[in-house]
Interface confidence: low
């Protein structure tokens, strides 16, 4: 399942972030 952590990140099987930004490792913004 998917859960929202305290920092507002949507955590799934691979901790993929829904609020991607400059600091989000799981985003595409390198």
């Amino acid at each position: 399942g998917w859960t929202l952590n305290s920092a507002g990140y949507l955590l799934g099987p691979h901790a993929v972030g829904n609020h991607r930004s400059f600091s989000d490792k799981n985003g595409l913004t390198s």
Epitope: S21, F22, S23, D24, L28, T29
Partner: antibody, heavy 113, light 112 residues
Amino acid sequence: EIQLQQSEAELVRPGALVKLSCKTSGFNIKDYYMHWVKQRPEQGLEWIGRIDPENDNSIYDPNFQGKASITADTSSNTAYLQLSSLTSEDTAVYYCVRGYVDWGQGTLVTVSA
Amino acid sequence: DVLMTQTPLSLPVSLGDQASISCRSSQSIVHSDGDTYLEWYLQKPGQSPKLLIFKVSNRFSGVPDRFSGSGSGTDFTLKISRVEAEDLGVYYCFQGSHVPYTFGGGTKLEIK
């Protein structure tokens, strides 16, 4: 609870180097990029660069290439920023950042003879 | 590098007034994935910056609805509908679409 605890203020001599630490808790550092941001006194914010602690891959703003080195120790969940050949231009507060929500309290580095 | 230009540098307001801050980027900050990673932060004196808005117009959790973000391409705006004392500080825009990531120069919101 997510915490980023940065090292104490540093007073360093011109030409020296300094290594700042950012001890994290409440999350696994491997799961996030760790960034460093510079703020000179009464000035704005500058992005220095970031590291992927899982593989030590780092990228930098070209302005900080050769000046800054970002490393991480996954065993202690700590990120580091090393600054070399310090000058008065390096006098600033340095923040570590995890996710765009979580910032450390900042470390003041003062470069003075 | 993407230059982020904020105006005004200083914004004197009366409590209860509306405030508007502009941020222009020197090139499009639409990412190749189609999203625009434009954020707004507030830094109060002696504190670390705090996120207000992400991806142009999304309020972060806990941010009052008097804050709103808008814009597209290269032109972005942060509006505060009714300024309260706790809103005073320096506001920064930030682009997280293109490396190196860059901040605007800041806008100081102060009491008139």
